[in-house]
Interface confidence: medium
Amino acid sequence: WELTILHTNDVHSRLEQTSEDSSKCVNASRCMGGVARLFTKVQQIRRAEPNVLLLDAGDQYQGTIWFTVYKGAEVAHFMNALRYDAMALGNHEFDNGVEGLIEPLLKEAKFPILSANIKAKGPLASQISGLYLPYKVLPVGDEVVGIVGYTSKETPFLSNPGTNLVFEDEITALQPEVDKLKTLNVNKIIALGHSGFEMDKLIAQKVRGVDVVVGGHSNTFLYTGNPPSKEVPAGKYPFIVTSDDGRKVPVVQAYAFGKYLGYLKIEFDERGNVISSHGNPILLNSSIPEDPSIKADINKWRIKLDNYSTQELGKTIVYLDGSSQSCRFRECNMGNLICDAMINNNLRHADETFWNHVSMCILNGGGIRSPIDERNNGTITWENLAAVLPFGGTFDLVQLKGSTLKKAFEHSVHRYGQSTGEFLQVGGIHVVYDLSRKPGDRVVKLDVLCTKCRVPSYDPLKMDEVYKVILPNFLANGGDGFQMIKDELLRHDSGDQDINVVSTYISKMKVIYPAVEGRIKFS
């Protein structure tokens, strides 16, 4: 019996087609992805093959103005239109709190939404009961397939799930649910979830009875043969893990942003054992036409976005200096504003010993592309912010050793004075440079804001300590020459859309007046 699994993950609000790097589509003939194009390909496969499942491994939420405006209603609407068979909850599905998940998505979705390792307690338990499930048995042709869901247990540090959801260890939570499916005589089981490729592989190895793992969160690109675009494969598709009981378990992921449709064919024997698995992600490029009915629907929903982008988010009573003459040479108040917004977006009261789990932000000055003039009645719009942050990136959470941070700050000024983009803007950090010293030895003082304290204060950076830092995904990926961050990071979790982070902060503060306050000094 053959099953075709079509899968997406980490789509992050890319409902419209995008350019090759998943930013806003400029030249339509070279654009990719989007739900209209995805639907064309899905329908084509559904017509050609008998047993097809369309699955999503989480993080539909967050990433473009679509989510800012529609807050998840767009996800439910278009996933329903594409007739997804199941979805796993990702960490970003909690970005607007549990209410922001229940109302727009859980109550509106016509497909099961899954997670076996999220347990509700207190008053939320009855409110959310039945709206998401640990597993679902789906009829496919003459057979049944069990889908068990899972979500990163780090979600409380990455999003806003509140205090009435407990995120358990994935493997511990999955095993009893898989065992339950086995007792129901379901012998073909897919683990669908959002914990990253390393956890996907562990699930394949450890959870007895799981036949296939379809994952997300780490934006992992797998491919067999010559890859069709810029993404470099992390391994073959499917990635085969040998389980503890000696089975071959295929593990798949399909990069991110709806650029690819994962396509996996699995052959099962009569006892539900995987005999063979093969496939590859399908690049959704312009050779695949956009479905006209879905495209028309997208255009209808778009109208509200155009109106939103010119509405006032808040006011500034000071000039927001985002000029390259400032942000690439010294502390600039636009950099301070963005970093403050980045920290504010990551306020998660860990426990009584920590005021917050993260206190530091770094931001490449070259990523700040425009100032905002306060003399336009102080008005700040989404459109203004899109000029400041035009690249459609995310502000991510990483863990780095102090020694890596020190290298990053040395890199920040290693060729100072040439208006290069690597000059770092900061938050929760006080740095002093001596430019008379040779490159690689110019940081003379580097103090960081404590997290394990009730009154935040600045302490000298410790080389061997592990610190959490918020930074643009561009830096996490080694951009602007920050290779040491990419090579030495101990953990990387993708965060929220950059403009959304700043716009939310401005809306929350209502009136802003960021200053230059001595975060970056030269001795």
Epitope: Q205, K206, T242, D244, D245, G246, R247, K248, D269, R271, N273, V274, I275, S276
Partner: antibody
């Protein structure tokens, strides 16, 4: 229950080849790796390679690559290990093993 | 290749003794480690997989644990049928490798 039953002892001359069989029962043969391990007299265990009967996929220990050939016949649920260019130091007990269960072993003696 | 170094190579113990065998991996193998028991003239028998999971039918006096890249097999109260050679085996990377064995003898 799972059983792996191997073929009988063999005596071979140096330079010859030997083919050991391993018949599986009690589980779905095509869905689990079969490993081959050898043990020289009084020595420890040495992994030779593995085969996945479902698709014929193999992984070899480089010490045996080129001399060992692993095959599997799904129709009879039997795995085979052929070792060529035998020398006296290949005298050993050869085991087939799943991840939990082992065959009884086959003694291969290489002597002129 | 991943090397597994077992210690001791042999030990003498009495019935009822608590016995500990250690296996050190040359690099990180997670918990992809098996413990096998082999009696003279017999095939090895798997006791523990995934560092600490007991195979069905294996007495609970056997247990496995890990600290970093050091793996331990413990027999809490040695029984007459436990006198044998014990091997660790990793299945984290190719080639699969074994420890050199620990022979448990009667004192």
């Amino acid at each position: 229950q799972v059983q792996l039953v191997q073929s009988g002892a063999e005596v071979k001359k140096p330079g010859a080849s030997v083919k050991v069989s391993c018949k599986a029962s009690g589980y779905v043969f095509s869905s689990y790796w079969i490993n081959w391990v050898r043990q020289a007299p009084g020595q420890g265990l040495e992994w030779m390679g593995q085969i996945y009967p479902g698709d014929g996929n193999t992984n070899y220990n480089r010490n045996f690559k080129g001399r060992a050939t692993l095959t599997a016949d799904k129709s009879t649920s039997t795995a085979y290990m052929e070792l060529s260019s035998l020398r006296s130091e290949d005298t050993a007990v050869y085991f087939c093993a799943g991840f939990a269960d082992w065959g009884q072993g086959t003694l291969v003696t290489v002597s002129s | 290749d991943i090397q597994l170094t077992q210690s001791p190579s042999s030990l003498s113990a009495s019935v009822g003794d608590r016995v500990t065998i250690t296996c050190r991996a040359s690099q990180d193998i997670g918990d992809s480690l098996i413990w096998l028991q082999q009696k003279p003239g017999k095939a090895p028998k798997r006791l523990i997989y995934a560092t600490s999971s007991l195979d069905s039918g294996v007495p609970s006096r056997f247990s496995g644990s890990r600290s970093g890249t050091d793996y331990t097999l413990t027999i809490s109260s040695l029984q007459p049928e436990d006198f044998a050679t014990y091997y660790c085996q990793q299945y984290s990377g190719y080639p699969l490798t074994f420890g050199q064995g620990t022979k448990v003898e009667i004192k």
